[in-house]
Amino acid sequence: APVPPGEDSKDVAAPHRQPLTSSERIDKQIRYILDGISALRKETCNKSNMCESSKEALAENNLNLPKMAEKDGCFQSGFNEETCLVKIITGLLEFEVYLEYLQNRFESSEEQARAVQMSTKVLIQFLQKKAKNLDAITTPDPTTNASLLTKLQAQNQWLQDMTTHLILRSFKEFLQSSLRALRQM
């Protein structure tokens, strides 16, 4: 697994460096998770041909993965800091059930999958400290999540592989949009 943010060789070599600001810490945390996703995607793409498959729509019907849209206030046009922050946190909370699903999907990168999951929880905490309007953040229903997890795990092998690929791709894209939006805040 990659070294967690704040523990890279640059930090060790530069003990007198200024401590990271809240924004820098969030930025670093997202990039750390993105590195983890890249490693997981590598294993997924090496193991199956899902990354080249054109049958993604079949699996996507079973999923309701968070996506960033114009109305969420995270793009340059119509940027709205508070609306966007709520969307990012809500989206990350919604991704948690999918990250739980990923936990038993990797052989050589099991540790990496756990690191992505745990780092996302930390990121949510960082962002919640930043948010002013916590009431607007809806937490997914645990019962709904549990039944979704059961449903996903009951899929055939091909659909499970495709689901894994789609989760990783969507999570990566969501984080990249979040990263860009947070840099405007």
Partner: antibody
Framework: EVQLVQSGGGLIQPGGSLRLSCAAS????????MIWVRQAPGKGLEWVSD????????YYADSVKGRFTMSRDISKNTVYLQMNSLRAEDTGVYYC?????????????WGRGTLVTVSS | DIVMTQSPSTLSASVGDRVTITCRAS??????LAWYQQKPGRAPKVLIY???TLESGVPSRFSGSGSGTDFTLTISSLQPEDFATYYC????????FGQGTKLEIK
């Protein structure tokens, strides 16, 4: 071979419109970040806009915001720069390029550039 | 927009000299900075990215350093083919460039 083929430049009157095209080959624009950069005659490089492949999210430099629109046609593997309300200061060579990496760290592929001249 | 300020705008030097060009960002950009070389009539070519990573195929006499707001490009021993214009570019948000440094023969 990875390359960007540009077209659409030319002479245009102030206040006019022009659309630049940039056709990509050797890679897909749907999974890459694209960027337009311009260079006025004898001057430096100026970032104009970029398009993050995810959701087609576009960003613009203050100097062109509201006048220029960057878009893409995934089926044609082409990006566009629609330029409206053109001014004399928009004159220059326009480069279409590709950001490298998932986190764009630098430009790794450049088009050959197309000249836009705004003059009456 | 993030404003990138490059200095000097012109630099006169001789073959074998060590030269340094600096670039300052109007806000912190972590290490998201690249350096390009441009020759007349040509598209720019990347030398350094992520502040200090040397692009493949670029001679080791080029090096970059810095993070946050202050960055430098160093050419340890100038070669005749190095006389060109150099630009810094940030990729933290958008992709604004410095105004360029023209490196000319003394």
């Amino acid at each position: 071979e990875v390359q960007l083929v540009q077209s659409g430049g030319g002479l245009i009157q102030p206040g006019g419109s022009l659309r630049l095209s940039c056709a990509a080959s050797g890679f897909t624009i749907s999974s890459n970040y694209m960027i337009w950069v311009r260079q006025a005659p004898g001057k430096g490089l100026e970032w104009v806009s970029d398009l993050y492949y995810y959701a087609g999210d576009t960003y613009y430099a203050d100097s062109v915001k509201g006048r220029f629109t960057m878009s893409r046609d995934i089926s044609k593997n082409t990006v566009y720069l629609q330029m409206n309300s053109l001014r004399a200061e928009d004159t220059g060579v326009y480069y279409c390029a590709r950001w490298a990496d998932d986190h764009p760290s630098h430009i790794d592929v450049w088009g050959r550039g197309t000249l836009v001249t705004v003059s009456s | 927009d993030i404003v990138m300020t490059q200095s000097p705008s012109t630099l006169s030097a001789s073959v074998g000299d060590r030269v340094t060009i600096t670039c300052r960002a109007s806000q912190g950009i972590s290490s998201w900075l690249a350096w390009y070389q441009q020759k007349p009539g040509r598209a720019p070519k990347v030398l350094i990215y992520k502040a200090s990573t040397l692009e493949s195929g670029v001679p080791s006499r080029f090096s970059g350093s810095g993070s946050g707001t202050d960055f430098t490009l160093t050419i340890s021993s100038l070669q005749p083919e190095d006389f060109a214009t150099y630009y810094c570019q940030q990729s933290w948000l958008g992709g604004s460039f410095g105004q360029g440094t023209k490196l000319e023969i003394k």
